[in-house]
C-alpha cells in the first residue's frame, strides 16, 4: 500500500495527476461507518467541502483525494476530517517550465562519489496500474533502455554520469493522457573516502619521571573530522585527582584532514602512577588504534633500552 501523505507542506507542478492520502487510512472498519469529509480553504474562501461535483478534476476514493490533474488554482490548505481525527496539508501548485522537460523547483539533488554504486529506478507505486509506459531522460534527451515499464540505471558512477535525470510516467485516465515527472540532479564528486587515522610516534612509550614532579603525555594523530581521540587509564577515568585530560587541539591540514593533539597531564607523580598503562586511543568508523605510555622512575632507566624512551 502506498504511504500516506504525512508532509504538511507540499509543492507540486501544474498539469500533473496528484493525490493526498490521509494517515488514518488503515482504520478500515471505522472508515466504512464514519462520515468523512475533505475541505479546502484558500484566501477569502473558508473551508469549502470538496466532492466530485466541486470539479470534474477531483475524485474521492476511501482515503484519497485525487486531482486529474492539479492546477494552479488548487493552491491552498486542505483538510481531512473523520470523527475527531483531522489532518491538514498546505498545497502549493507551481508553474510548469514550458521550455524544459522538468521544473527546476521540483528537483531532488543527489551527490554520488565516483566509482561508487549509482542507481536510478523509475517507479510510481500509486499510479502503477494506470501507467502505460515510462521513459527516462538525461538532460531532457531520452535514454534507450530495455525496460519501458520501470527504466533503471545501475552502475558504478563516472564523472560523465552527472546531469538531470527525469523519469516520465505516461498514464491514461478517463480517456485522457497525463504524465508525471520526477527529476534527480545527480552530481558526481571525487572519492571522499576517509583516511585511516594515524597515531604519530611509537606504539609503546616509556617516559622517565621523578616522583613529586609533573609530566605531560602528548598524544597526536592525523584524523578525519568525526574521529575521536581520548585517554584511557586506571579502572575508571577521573578517579585520580592528579590526572587531567587537557583540551584537544585541532589544526586542519591542507588536504582537509585534521592534526589533533591531546595532552594527559599527571601532577605530583606518585608510586601509583608508575608502571601502569596510560592508553591514548583514536577511534574512527574504520576502527581503533591505540598507543601506550608507561611512567618509569628515572633511577630505573638503565634497565630499559634507550630507543624506547620519550622525554
Amino acid at each position: 500500500a502506498e504511504s500516506c501523505t504525512s508532509r504538511p507542506h507540499i509543492t507540486v507542478v501544474e498539469g500533473e495527476p496528484f493525490y493526498l492520502k490521509h494517515c488514518s487510512c488503515s482504520l478500515a472498519h471505522e472508515i466504512e461507518t464514519t462520515t468523512k469529509s475533505w475541505y479546502k480553504s484558500s484566501g477569502s474562501q473558508e473551508h469549502v467541502e470538496l466532492n466530485p461535483r466541486s470539479s470534474s478534476r477531483i475524485a474521492l476514493h476511501d482515503c484519497v483525494l485525487e486531482f486529474w490533474p492539479v492546477e494552479l488554482n488548487d493552491t491552498g490548505s486542505y483538510f481531512f476530517q473523520m470523527k475527531n481525527y483531522t489532518q491538514k496539508w498546505k498545497l502549493n501548485v507551481i508553474r510548469r517550465n514550458k521550455h524544459s522537460c522538468f521544473t527546476e523547483r521540483q528537483v531532488t539533488s543527489k551527490i554520488v562519489e565516483v566509482k561508487k554504486f549509482f542507481q536510478i529506478t523509475c517507479e510510481n507505486s500509486y499510479y502503477q496500474t494506470l501507467v502505460n509506459s515510462t521513459s527516462l531522460y538525461k538532460n531532457c534527451k531520452k535514454l534507450l533502455l530495455e525496460n519501458n515499464k520501470n527504466p533503471t540505471i545501475k552502475k558504478n558512477a563516472e564523472f560523465e554520469d552527472q546531469g538531470y535525470y527525469s523519469c516520465v510516467h505516461f498514464l491514461h485516465h478517463n480517456g485522457k493522457l497525463f504524465n508525471i515527472t520526477k527529476t534527480f540532479n545527480i552530481t558526481i564528486v571525487e572519492d571522499r573516502s576517509n583516511i585511516v587515522p594515524v597515531l604519530l610516534g611509537p606504539k609503546l612509550n616509556h617516559v622517565a619521571v621523578e616522583l613529586g614532579k609533573n609530566v605531560r603525555l602528548n598524544c597526536s594523530a592525523l584524523l578525519n573530522e568525526e574521529d575521536v581521540i581520548y585517554w584511557m587509564f586506571g579502572e575508571e577515568n577521573g578517579s585520580d585527582p592528579n590526572i587531567h585530560e587537557e583540551k584537544e587541539m585541532r589544526i586542519m591540514t591542507p588536504e582537509g584532514k585534521w592534526h589533533a593533539s591531546k595532552v594527559l597531564r599527571i601532577e605530583n607523580i606518585g608510586e601509583s602512577n608508575l608502571n601502569v598503562l596510560y592508553n591514548c586511543t583514536v577511534a574512527s568508523t574504520g576502527g581503533t588504534d591505540t598507543k601506550s605510555f608507561i611512567l618509569v622512575r628515572k633511577a630505573d632507566m638503565a634497565d630499559i633500552p634507550g630507543h624506547v624512551f620519550t622525554r
Epitope: F117, S193, N194, V196, E225, E226, V228, I229, Y230, K247, E248, R250, A260, A283, S284, T285, G286, G287, T288, D289, T290
Partner: antibody, heavy 115, light 113 residues
Framework: QVQLVQSGAEVKKPGASVKVSCKAS????????ISWVRQAPGQGLEWMGW????????NYAQKVQGRVTMTTDTSTNTAYMELRSLRSDDTAVYYC????????WGRGTLVTVSS | DIVMTQSPDSLAVSLGERATINCKSS????????????LAWYQQKPGQPPKLLIY???TRESGVPDRFSGSGSGTDFTLTISSLQAEDVAVYYC?????????FGQGTKLEIK
C-alpha cells in the same frame, strides 16, 4: 550491491565453539570496522565488540572478553567471530554490522546452544 | 561504561499522531572538538536486522522518510515520528558510539493504539 552476507545457522552443544563469517561486498572493506551484535530470543541488542578491518585491532565487551576472537581476512573481505565455551545463554541471532553507527547489517546467524 | 536508558519501554500511538521516544546516556556523548553527538537510532521489525534511521543524533539516513527526526545533545536525546503510519510498528533502539564498549538502549516497542 553493498551488503554483508553471513554464514548459516548453527546448533552447538554447551562447551563447544562456533565461528560465524560475514562477507562484505561492493565497498572498500578496510574503510570500515566490523562490529558484532547479538540478540537473544525476545531480547534487545547487545554489542559484543568490533575489529578494525585496516589493522586488525579489536575491542571486546567485558561480558564476552576471553571467550571471543574477532578476525578479518582482507583478501576475501570477510570478518569472522569465534565464540568459545558456549553456554545456553549464548543462544542468539548474531549480526555483523558496518562502521560505528551501523548503516549496513548482515541478515543474522542463529546460533542455538543446547544439550 | 556508558549506559543508555530509553523511555518508555512501550508506547501505543494512534495512526497519524506523533510518537516520541527518549534516550538518556549515563555520560555525555557530545564531542567538544567537533560538536558532534555520537548517537544513532535504529528501527527493528520482527525477523529482520535493525535498520539505521538517524546518526550524529539528528542526521537522517538516506532513504528514511522525513517523518522520522532526531534531536537532543549531550545526554538527552529524542526520536520523533511526526505522523505515525502502520509500517512504523517496530522496536526502536538508541546506540552510543562515543566510547567502547558501544552500547544500546533496552529498546522501545511502538504499537498502534
Amino acid at each position: 550491491q553493498v551488503q554483508l552476507v553471513q554464514s548459516g545457522a548453527e546448533v552447538k552443544k554447551p562447551g563447544a565453539s562456533v565461528k560465524v563469517s560475514c562477507k562484505a561486498s561492493d565497498y572498500t572493506f578496510t574503510t570500515y570496522g566490523i562490529s558484532w551484535v547479538r540478540q537473544a530470543p525476545g531480547q534487545g541488542l547487545e554489542w559484543m565488540g568490533w575489529i578494525s578491518a585496516y589493522n586488525g585491532n579489536t575491542n571486546y565487551a567485558q561480558k564476552v572478553q576471553g571467550r571471543v576472537t574477532m578476525t578479518t581476512d582482507t583478501s576475501t573481505n570477510t570478518a569472522y567471530m569465534e565464540l568459545r565455551s558456549l553456554r545456553s545463554d549464548d543462544t542468539a541471532v548474531y549480526y555483523c554490522a558496518r562502521g560505528w553507527y551501523f548503516d549496513l547489517w548482515g541478515r543474522g546467524t542463529l546460533v542455538t546452544v543446547s544439550s | 561504561d556508558i549506559v543508555m536508558t530509553q523511555s518508555p519501554d512501550s508506547l501505543a500511538v494512534s495512526l497519524g499522531e506523533r510518537a516520541t521516544i527518549n534516550c538518556k546516556s549515563s555520560q555525555s556523548v557530545l564531542y567538544s572538538s567537533n560538536n558532534k553527538n555520537y548517537l544513532a537510532w535504529y528501527q527493528q521489525k520482527p525477523g529482520q536486522p535493525p535498520k539505521l534511521l538517524i546518526y550524529w543524533a539528528s542526521t537522517r539516513e538516506s532513504g528514511v522518510p522525513d517523518r522520522f527526526s532526531g534531536s537532543g545533545s549531550g545526554t538527552d536525546f529524542t526520536l520523533t515520528i511526526s505522523s505515525l503510519q502502520a509500517e512504523d510498528v517496530a522496536v526502536y533502539y538508541c546506540q552510543q558510539y562515543y566510547r567502547t564498549p558501544y552500547s544500546f538502549g533496552q529498546g522501545t516497542k511502538l504499537e498502534i493504539k
